[in-house]
């Protein structure tokens, strides 16, 4: 190997990372010029832009699939971007129906062939953009990795690309003889990578002697509000849950200028920027008479984009609960039901690009995801407190009010690319 390559400044020709197999859609869903109707932001690689749009398509469909299997009172939080990135690691070594299903479920078949063939390179570019922001006021930390049984010999090229693009080689572990020790090792690695924020990503007994390959992806975000909430204005107030019950939440308050719009059927959309302006939190709050489930059902990337495009800066009063959501789950059954069947099947999986001996019995035993978000007066995740001098609660009856005292959707996005980094719902901010 020569000198190490910086993936963030590299050109595609600098890194030969052609996948073992390539996918061609029979319907040719994507064309080279697709997506040109929407203006690509300045200083943005059009292929990274395409990938970001594919991620948004996956984000909304996966969220809907997951939400359908949750109780309406359950909080949900996930990083569709992190999930897509992790599964793109398996795409690099996938062939046949396994590859086709990865392409379809993750919406990679909606992007041009040139982008999808070099998807790892463009994922790396997208991640460079998100994880290497010059602005030090926000922090995005992810830990994505494949862990395989040590009896396998892994393809060296796969290992090199995995390290270069995704920041981690596939790690061999002794699942057969030391399943519980392996679980502890994975959880420790994730904990270290996320500075102790995310622990126990793999639940007990999720790994056994039959485990072959485990995919783990975890992520957390820490950001400071551009305009902080004053703790003196926080009050205990009732939050009305989907089941008609209420609970006592710590409701933060501030008046200020924010991008806001009341859209179809009285749904309110508010954007709260984090310091640096590149990353924002978008809140979607249905009117009291409309259930959040209905909004979730109608949600598409196009609807979301339309709403974001309509936002206008205005003075308003914001009431928003403090909350902490930690959500972790196995992705296996959700993705199998969505059509990603072969990857998890010992009989059908085709991952020849991952192992050295060309074995065709390699499959993913399970995949785990965990993300967490804490929102308070300072921003997301507790930060060192600084004095904030903000006026108290005024009684301006004419001011537009955004009062999140009932279930709402939350997105954290990178603005220029409109990449959905996180999405979820706050159905119960009172849970500790």
């Amino acid at each position: 190997h020569g000198s190490p390559v910086d993936i963030c400044t590299a050109k595609p020709r600098d890194i030969p990372m052609n996948p073992m197999c390539i996918y061609r859609s029979p319907e040719k869903k994507a064309t080279e010029d697709e997506g040109s109707e929407q203006k690509i932001p300045e200083a943005t690689n059009r292929r990274v832009w395409e990938l970001s749009k594919a991620n948004s398509r996956f984000a909304t469909t996966f969220y809907q699939h997951l939400a359908d299997s949750k109780n309406d009172n359950d909080n949900i939080f996930l990083s569709p971007l992190s999930i897509s990135t992790a599964f793109a690691m398996t795409k690099l070594g996938a062939c046949n129906d396994t590859l086709q299903q990865l392409m379809e479920v993750f919406k990679f078949d909606t992007i041009s062939e040139k982008t999808s063939d070099q998807i790892h390179f463009f994922f790396a570019k997208l991640n460079c953009r998100l994880y290497r922001k010059a602005n030090k006021s926000s922090k995005l930390v992810s830990a994505n990795r494949l862990f395989g049984d040590k009896s396998l010999t892994f393809n060296e090229t796969y290992q090199d690309i995995s390290e270069l693009v995704y920041g981690a080689k596939l790690q061999p572990l002794d699942f057969k003889e030391n399943a519980e020790q392996s679980r502890a090792a994975i959880n420790k690695w994730v904990s270290n990578k996320t500075e102790g924020r995310i622990t126990d990503v793999i639940p007990s007994e999720a790994i056994n002697e039959l485990t072959v390959l485990v995919l783990v992806n975890t992520i957390y975000f820490k950001g400071l509000w551009k305009s902080k909430f004053s703790p003196e204005n926080t009050r205990k107030e009732l939050f009305y849950k989907a089941d008609g019950e209420s609970c006592s939440a710590s409701m933060m308050y501030q008046e200020g200028k924010f991008r806001y719009r009341r859209v179809a059927e009285g749904t309110q959309v508010l954007e709260l920027p984090f310091k640096g302006d590149d990353i924002t939190m978008v809140l979607i709050l249905p009117k009291p008479e409309k259930s959040l489930a209905k909004v979730e059902k109608e949600l598409t990337p196009e609807v979301l984009q339309e709403w974001l495009d309509e936002l206008e800066e205005m003075m308003l009063v914001v009431h928003m609960p403090r909350f902490r959501i930690e959500d972790g789950f196995s992705l296996k059954e959700q993705l199998q039901d969505m059509g990603l069947v072969d990857l998890f099947s010992p009989e059908k999986s085709k991952l020849p690009g991952i192992v050295a001996e060309g074995r065709d019995d390699l499959y993913v035993s399970d995949a785990f995801h965990k993300a967490f978000l804490e929102v308070n007066e300072e921003g997301s995740e507790a930060a060192a407190s600084t004095a904030v001098v903000i006026a108290g609660r005024s009684l301006n009856p004419n001011r537009v009010t955004f009062k999140a005292n009932r279930p709402f959707l939350v997105f954290i996005r990178e603005v220029p690319l409109n990449t959905i980094i996180f999405m979820g719902r706050v159905a119960n901010p009172c849970v500790k």
């Epitope: 469909t61 809907q64 699939h65 939400a67 359908d68 299997s69 949750k70 109780n71 309406d72 089941d243 489930a293 979730e296 059902k297 059954e333 959700q334 199998q336 039901d337 969505m338």
Partner: nanobody, 114 residues
Amino acid sequence: QVQLQESGGGLVQPGGSLRLSCAASALTFSSRAWAWYRQAPGKQRELVASITGGGTTNYADSVKGRFTISRDNAKNTVYLQMNSLKPEDTAVHYCNGYRYTYAWGQGTQVTQVT
């Protein structure tokens, strides 16, 4: 891939009853929200009723008090009991997820005979 198989439709007199069944092959069936939809000739597909994993039900105003959605998790089956049928209930009835829809099944035809 999740397969959906609807059955139980047929010809029915005004005021009559039918019970529709839908077998779904989803691994996450028991925790998942399911729904019945219908499509009348020349009209858009519309939501008729839904049921969450916890058993909470919701109905379109036009069928409230007449239709009942239920589920049997042991059989991976969702039902729609249709009573007091009206001419406007004539349509192909489909079942699918509530928020997330899988590939649509063939549906089952419900026809009012007058």
